[in-house]
Interface confidence: low
């Protein structure tokens, strides 16, 4: 009997730049099929617990499961499938119709090049001089990948880096993002967002450690010459970063065009559509670019942005260049002005 | 017959810019983006950059980032690629290559311009 | 960036031998976007093959593509004297673009 669970189970995401995200393919025994989102009994718009395919991730050597659910848009090969059973079971599929399939969407987390610890070290009286110093991004919980208040550990003393507004660390941020595998530095996280507000339910381990750092210097290269340890503050502000690492991205498709690789712009937040509303942080191809990418279409070929003349109109609006920089939508609820992008077409 | 023809060599000081031009014909210019890429003396290629000619959004190669404007002219159809501050590692043949499909690929190439930067 | 290493650098053939060039990449690619080109001295490149075993328009039969992954392989069944030249291979899968260092197939 096929399953996800199967080790000889072969999968595939397609229809974005990552290989851990996408659209799900799988192979039986005459070729790749997309799977609908409508198999298992489920409804097509319905969200599932990602970590039921976890297996699937792990095969294509990817992070955790992130969402696993209805992908942004169908894109139809020659051969979908429903299939029946236990969820994640593929010894009792049909052939679907290509317009009544919904494909089935799964995100895992990219995987990372060294995986640095996830969990804390365990308090100790004994020093440890010879553990290599080390950082940790702590997210919220349900927060997101790469991004968090920075923890920096120095043989078994562990705690926050104390930060000033005024502190000039451009170099610093990006040396720590780097050092976390994460890509480089995007903007510092309000504490709110980073997750420093504690929980009151929230288990002993995850109290604010005994130690904080301060930034010793802001050029270092090497993780023992960053920070000195300081005498924890009640108050002041702690180092909490957002890098490009960061996962979920914010996943984006084109509708209303005449083919897949044009159309108006929307994105997603969550389980929900809507259209992505113009921004003067925008104002150049790289944006349309990564959006035409994850079309698999070819390059922009132009774009125009539509007169939001209905005070109504609304959307999400990111403001960085790059959705890839966005970690954050913002809702507009009037006089959002839409954009239409007409990328290279495959099959022009 | 779709030919991109570039403009001639160019001999520059350190520090200088140098702009070298890609006239597209044979085709629907605003229809395809335009690519350059460069190849030092002996080397192998090196993108740099993209135009979308019907638009003139650029994307380009975070090593030139900064130093590099891309730009079009429809009324002419040509593309334009300016390199500035320029050092003796930028000698190097440019080329311009025209983007075809969903593929990603460069279908017709300029004849190149050799940019020599010398003291 | 995606780093492509073809081998071997120099390939030293006689006309009428078949040609084996190898393109390796340090990160899986998708097979849409591996391509092939040739360039003689003094000449620009020129497109051979596109999506890893597409021909070009003009492009003879006896040049062949295939691969996946991060392996990619162009074939040349008989060298004919006009093959020789240096191929490169190149990469649209990621940002950025990236070229093989190229191999030089030269007359023995």
């Known amino acids: 009997r096929l399953s996800w669970y199967d080790p000889d189970f072969q999968a595939r995401l397609t229809r974005s730049n990552s290989k851990c995200q996408g659209q799900l393919e799988v192979y039986l025994k005459d070729g790749w099929h997309m799977v609908c989102s409508q198999s298992w009994g489920r409804s097509s718009k319905q969200w599932e617990d990602p970590s039921q395919a976890s297996k699937v991730c792990q095969r294509l050597n990817c992070g955790v499961p992130l969402s696993l659910g209805p992908f942004l848009v169908t894109y139809t090969p020659q051969s979908s499938i429903i299939c029946y059973g236990q969820l994640g079971s593929f010894s009792n599929c049909s052939h679907s119709r290509n317009d009544m399939c919904h494909s089935l969407g799964l995100t895992c987390l990219e995987p990372q090049k060294t995986t640095p610890p996830t969990t804390r070290p365990p308090p100790t009286t004994t020093p440890e001089p010879t553990a290599p110093p080390r950082l940790q991004l702590v997210a919220q919980s349900g927060g997101q990948h790469c991004a968090g208040v920075v923890e920096f550990y120095s043989g078994s003393l562990g705690g926050t880096i104390s930060y000033e507004a005024q502190d000039k660390t451009q170099d610093l941020e990006n040396f720590l993002c780097n050092n976390l595998q994460c890509g480089s530095f995007l903007k510092h996280l309000p504490e709110t967002e980073a997750g420093r507000a504690q929980d009151p339910g929230e288990p002993r381990e995850h109290q604010p450690l005994p130690i904080q750092w301060k930034i010793q210097n802001s050029s270092c290269t090497s993780l023992e010459h960053c920070f000195r340890k300081i005498k924890p503050q009640k108050s002041g502000r702690v180092l909490a970063l957002l890098c490009s690492g960061f996962q979920p991205k914010v996943q984006s498709r084109l509708v209303g065009g005449s083919s897949i690789c044009e159309g108006t712009v929307e994105v997603r937040q969550g389980a929900q559509w809507a259209a992505l509303c113009d921004s003067s942080s925008a104002r150049s191809s790289l944006r349309w670019e990564e959006v035409c990418r994850e079309q698999q279409c070819g390059s922009v070929n132009s774009y125009r942005v539509l007169d939001a003349g209905d005070p109504t109109s609304r959307g999400l609006f990111c403001p960085h260049q790059k959705l890839s920089q966005c970690h954050e939508l913002w809702e507009r609820n009037s006089y959002c002005k839409k954009v239409f992008v007409t990328c290279q077409d495959p099959n022009p | 017959q779709v030919q991109l023809v570039q403009s001639g060599a160019e001999v520059k000081k350190p520090g200088a810019s140098v702009k070298v031009s890609c006239k597209g014909s044979?085709?629907?210019?605003?229809?395809?983006?335009i690519h350059w890429v460069r190849q030092a003396p002996g080397q192998t290629l090196e993108w740099m950059g993209l135009i979308s000619t019907s638009s003139g959004d650029v994307s380009y190669n975070q090593k030139f980032q900064g130093r590099v404007t891309m730009t079009v002219d429809k009324s002419t159809s040509t593309a334009y690629m300016e390199l500035s501050s320029l050092r003796s590692e930028d000698t190097a043949v440019y080329y311009c290559a025209r983007h075809y499909g969903a593929n990603n690929y460069f279908d017709y190439w300029g004849q190149g311009t050799l940019v020599t930067v010398s003291s | 960036e995606i780093v492509l290493t073809q081998s071997p650098g120099t390939l030293s053939l006689s006309p009428g031998e078949r040609a084996t060039l190898s393109c390796r990449t340090n990160s899986s690619v998708s097979s849409s976007y591996l391509h092939w080109y040739q360039q003689k001295p003094g000449q620009s490149p020129r497109l051979l093959i596109y999506g890893t075993s597409n021909l070009a328009s003009g492009v003879p039969t006896r040049f062949s593509g295939s691969g996946s992954g991060t392996d990619y392989t162009l074939t040349i069944s008989r060298l004919e004297p006009e093959d020789f030249a240096v191929y490169f291979c190149?990469?649209?899968?990621?940002?950025?673009?990236?070229f093989g260092g190229g191999t030089k197939v030269e007359i023995k």
């Open positions: 044979g085709y629907t210019f605003t229809n395809f983006a």
């Open positions: 190149q990469q649209y899968s990621g940002y950025p673009l990236t």
